[in-house]
Amino acid sequence: LMGGQDKPFLSARPSTVVPRGGHVALQCHYRRGFNNFMLYKEDRSHVPIFHGRIFQESFIMGPVTPAHAGTYRCRGSRPHSLTGWSAPSNPLVIMVTGNHRKPSLLAHPGPLLKSGETVILQCWSDVMFEHFFLHREGISEDPSRLVGQIHDGVSKANFSIGPLMPVLAGTYRCYGSVPHSPYQLSAPSDPLDIVITGLYEKPSLSAQPGPTVQAGENVTLSCSSWSSYDIYHLSREGEAHERRLRAVPKVNRTFQADFPLGPATHGGTYRCFGSFRALPCVWSNSSDPLLVSVTGNPSSSWPSPTEPSSKSGICRHLH
């Protein structure tokens, strides 16, 4: 990661993708340390305060404007050299978001995937974006970039992610950029949580008072395991949102969550998954499906199947 013998390494924390009005810390790592450095922008636009200024350890930039977008380099202090400064660092591209209307982000076949599978994340917009960028929350690397394809007044790009492993799980957002302003990005798409299942042993799912109940009777689904899961997720076939609850240790040394469904109106097939707080987007194998049947209610309506949505903050910690 570090630069060559006389080349510093310039990096951004927390990310090279910065919302308009936000702040970012630029660090110039030179010769095993963060020393004094100079910073400059390749296109020389804006940032007059860089000229002739020396920064110590890190430079906090912001509140950022579209004019901050661009390529930066630094030079580390080298007192005994001819110029007093190192060779220029690697180029660091800072992208500023919030400059155009947000695009949409979809997952195909869906956002809940098994380890080893591949998912296509499609970013699209009716704004004629030249490039699309895909960024995963919490990582400081540059986002993936693809050229937008334009068909029928819609620009879109398909990002292939996989084979999926735990490190690829998380919250994704995409952005668009227009020609001539490649680093001035749109507002972010709504977040899309990509969840990887099948990494840990399956929990068991049971119903109280039982899987077959009278209409109007209260039903509770219990998800439990010997594994010390922190959170359980309950999904219903054909329903867009999962429910989640914190796991509670029981006297028999299992970890359990009880999901009250309330008075039964119509049945359905349920599954549950376990996950750990440290990796909220990495789930266990699915429990065996549990079919809950409701009797005495012939007119019950079944919801139409929809693609499971992961826009409810699955990948955030449950506090």
Epitope: R13, H23, A25, I49, Q56, E57, I60, G62
Partner: antibody
């Protein structure tokens, strides 16, 4: 939303010390710095200096070097201004404000009144 | 140190008027000028930075312009809630310095 909450008013005797706190919320504390500004009826708004919350490196305006010191508790998202050997002319309202190397102060604390009187 | 001068201590306007605050720097500050509003009993609030960039949530009746040493803040249609002291600040070189402020009063 971004908020900076400062500690309450202080009444001190000359020669004493005071420590003003500024607790930040609503953003990642270490991605920005904390600026400190003094407001007096005579001189208006004066920049005391700032501390880089990412590196912990402070920078002081020439007129405030010596008795003024900045510190951080990043785990509590809190910045501190300590003034030692207080003088009557330190009587002022002290503001913390979020900002970085570019000197723009985008969110301000409510201010802490420090009165130095014997 | 760069001195920022706001020549008017007071400005008076009626609701709906257009009002302009001026600020002069003792040297070229290369558009690195911010404007703050301080209402009675409150802390300053950022309105404009880099001469003309409006801060989040600031109404578009506030605008800034200028270059070199001369900068202005304009309120296109003054509202009663705009009663405050307005400060300019240069963020070109440390120490950052503020103007003495201009108090806006409503007639």
């Amino acid at each position: 939303q971004i908020q900076l909450v400062q500690s309450g008013s202080e009444l001190k005797k000359p020669g004493a010390s005071v420590k003003v706190s500024c607790k930040a919320s609503g953003y990642t504390f270490t991605t920005a710095g904390m600026q400190w500004v003094q407001k007096t009826p005579g001189k208006g708004l004066e920049w005391i200096g700032w501390i880089n919350s990412h590196s912990g490196v402070p920078k002081y305006a020439e007129d405030f070097k010596g008795r003024f010191a900045f510190s951080l508790d990043t785990s509590a998202s809190t910045a501190y201004l300590q003034i030692s050997s207080l003088k009557a002319e330190d009587t002022a309202v002290y503001f913390c404000a979020r900002g970085g190397d570019e000197g723009v102060m985008d969110y301000w604390g409510q201010g802490t009144s420090v009165t130095v009187s014997s | 140190d760069i001195v920022m001068t706001q020549s008017h201590k007071f400005l008076s306007a009626s609701v709906g008027d257009r009002v302009t605050f001026t600020c002069k720097a003792s040297q070229d500050v290369s558009t690195a000028v911010a404007w703050y509003q301080q209402k009675p009993g409150q802390s300053p609030k950022l309105l404009i930075y880099w001469t003309s960039t409006r801060h989040t949530g600031v109404p578009d009746r506030f605008s800034g312009s200028g270059s070199g040493t001369d900068y202005t803040l304009t309120i296109s249609s003054v509202q009663a809630e705009d009663v405050a002291v307005y400060y300019c600040q240069q963020h070109y070189s440390t120490p950052w310095t503020f103007g003495g402020g201009t108090k806006l009063e409503i007639k």
